[in-house]
């Protein structure tokens, strides 16, 4: 059960929010929609997984509300129609609170996790295969919709690992309700990798606010910088990383580097005191020449959120911001295996870590 | 390699208040959800709470609902139960576990435990 | 809350034998059971994740199921290092997200 090719994340998606789901929904498929609920008006949000734009054909309606004490209604709506609700009188979602909700998509019904723990299990109504697009509506505020390929699983999995992995990339910014990902580079078909997505969460009442999102006084999923973590099995071709984050309002300069032992492979350094990205290697303590050339304006600004995708490839690194391509950079040091290690540190908040 | 390391236990009287720390290396508690669960001499294990981090959600079994508190602390991969009004009930061997990471969500079940702290209430 | 209700609270067995140990739980919870082995003064390990899922290091006599909301925890050949007590775990969210069976304690016949 292998499937090539990824479907790039939707990246804090305005509400109303409808997006395709690329080859439609796979026995296997992991979708993770990852946000807050809103604390001012309504009652209700809903997650739609759904053939079309229509929503009259919606194989799957999540739907909790924050009414009578709090239920979530499950159900199927077949052309127009509605079918009997499924409720579940337990609420796992609290008004003002990020949540963190997945769905796994399995031959006989949708598992549904919300915060660590499973929720529910919806069983097929409809055929699965019918749902090409997913929908989001009401009282809600998304950071992202992630999707994550089938992938055949280990015979024994490690708890560290994930079972339906697949390097993903980001799409443009949304900026419509009916969302299709172009992707930013081709998705080439990937071998079995391990994901990992690292996340934190920052102290309660810290300020954080995005150009999209009014600042919030709720724990907020942000990292201890600077940030440092392994790349499982280092780089390869097709490997992909992905950061998102903040510049602070005040920033000077950032740097995400990929390092080999003491050598930094890859520095990649957003500077705004020189309104440049500039890129290098060290080897030994040496800095070798920099790569400052852009195909547009910097695209790093302060106070603003933003996205890294770097993939690898064999001959460079392909890097990406805010879903369009940016530059590349050719390997100096090319035992990719051994870059197995992220640094980020600077002036910047991040939110998203996946390796 | 992975571990959890429970430390705060101790005597303390009905009424009194104890800070449960649980620090883990190996892994990023962000990454997790960290439950407590408990064991009163002699007897079976009880759940107790859980966090999840990445979300800041927490949960609490009815009877320790509004007397305990938990709490992490990502900068130090530290798990915290603040146990306040403490009753003699509450004396047990105090765990903390890990539930499936981040990354392997749909796998069920705590695959890493402390070795527990003892919790004794008593006047 | 969802109970789990495991029994037999005790067996006796003899090395070699075959063990089986039932939870059942009160309302569906899909898949989301663990299981358990716990030796006096130690943390409990896990065995079974998933209800039927194999724990990493774990020897292979150990083995789980599901039939509906019927977990089962079969040993094939008891070895003397088995002798503990052995506890079923639910995930499904309800009031309380977790709940554990009261424990079986295996001792030597």
């Known amino acids: 059960m292998a499937f090539s090719g990824s479907q790039a994340p939707y990246l804090s998606p305005a509400v109303p929010f409808s997006g395709t789901i690329q080859g439609g929904l796979q026995d296997g498929l992991q979708i993770t929609v990852n946000g807050t609920v809103l604390s001012s008006s309504g009652t209700r949000f809903a997650v739609n997984f759904q053939t079309g734009f229509s929503g009259n054909d919606i194989a799957f309606h999540f739907n909790p509300r924050f009414e009578d004490g709090g239920y979530v209604v499950c159900n199927t709506r077949q052309n127009g129609s509605w079918g009997p609700e499924e409720r579940k009188t337990h609420m796992p979602f609290q008004k003002g609170m990020p949540f963190d909700l997945c769905f796994l998509v399995q031959s006989s019904d949708f598992k549904v996790m919300v915060n660590g723990i499973l929720f529910v299990q919806y069983f097929h109504r409809v055929p699965f295969h019918r749902v090409d697009t997913i929908s989001v509506n009401g009282s809600v505020q998304l950071s992202y919709i992630s999707f994550q390929n089938p992938r055949t699983v280990p015979v024994q999995p490690a708890f560290s690992t994930v079972p339906f992995s697949q390097p993903v990339c980001f799409p443009p910014r949304p900026r419509g309700r009916r969302q299709k990902p172009p992707g930013v580079w081709p998705a080439n078909p990937a071998p079995i990798t391990q994901t990992v997505i690292h996340t934190v969460q920052s102290a309660p009442g810290q300020m954080f606010s995005t150009p999209a999102i009014p600042p919030m006084m709720y724990p907020h999923p942000a990292y201890p910088m600077p940030f440092i973590t392994t790349i499982l099995g280092g780089l390869y071709p097709s490997k992909s990383i992905l950061l998102s984050g903040t510049v602070l309002p005040s920033a000077q300069r950032f740097h995400i580097n990929l390092c080999s032992g003491n050598h930094i492979a890859f520095h990649l350094n957003p500077r705004f005191d020189e309104n440049a990205v500039v890129r290098n290697t060290q080897i030994d303590n040496s800095w070798g020449s920099e790569e400052r050339s852009l195909p547009r304006k910097m695209p790093f600004v302060r106070g603003q959120s933003f996205s890294v995708w770097i993939l690898c490839e064999a001959h460079c690194l392909k890097v990406a911001v805010d879903g369009q391509h940016l530059f590349e950079y050719y390997h100096r040091l090319r035992n990719l295996p051994t870059i197995n290690r992220l640094e980020v540190g600077g002036d910047i908040q991040l939110t998203h870590v996946q390796t | 390699e992975v571990q959890l390391v429970e430390s705060g236990g101790g005597l303390v009287q009905p009424g009194g208040s104890l800070r449960l720390s649980c620090a883990a290396s190996?892994?990023?508690?962000?990454?997790?959800?960290i439950h407590w669960v408990r064991q009163a001499p002699g007897k079976g294990l009880e759940w107790v709470a859980y966090?999840?981090?990445?979300?800041?959600?927490?949960s609490y079994a009815d009877s320790v609902k509004g007397r305990f508190t938990i709490s992490a602390d990502t900068s130090k991969n530290t798990a915290y139960l603040q146990m306040n009004s403490l009753r003699a009930e509450d004396t047990a061997v105090y765990y903390c576990?890990?539930?499936?990471?981040?990354?392997?969500?749909?796998?069920?079940?705590?695959?890493?435990w402390g070795q527990g702290t003892l919790v004794t209430v008593s006047s | 809350d969802i109970q789990m209700t495991q029994s037999p609270s005790s067996l006796s067995a003899s090395v070699g034998d075959r063990v089986t140990i039932t939870c059942r739980a009160s309302?569906?919870?899909?898949?989301?059971v663990a299981w358990y082995q716990q030796k006096p003064g130690k943390a409990p390990k896990l065995l079974i994740y998933?209800?039927?899922s194999l724990y990493s290091g774990v020897p292979s006599r150990f083995s789980g199921s599901r039939s509906g909301t019927d977990f089962t925890l079969t040993i094939s050949s008891l070895q003397p290092e088995d002798f503990a007590t052995y506890y079923c775990?639910?995930?499904?969210?309800?009031?309380?997200?977790?709940?554990f069976g009261q424990g079986t304690k295996v001792e030597i016949k």
């Open positions: 190996g892994f990023t508690v962000s990454s997790s959800s």
């Open positions: 775990q639910q995930s499904y969210y309800d009031s309380n997200p977790i709940t």
């Open positions: 998933s209800a039927s």
């Open positions: 966090i999840y981090p990445y979300s800041g959600y927490t």
């Open positions: 309302q569906s919870v899909s898949s989301a």
């Open positions: 576990a890990r539930y499936s990471t981040y990354s392997s969500k749909w796998v069920w079940g705590m695959d890493y």
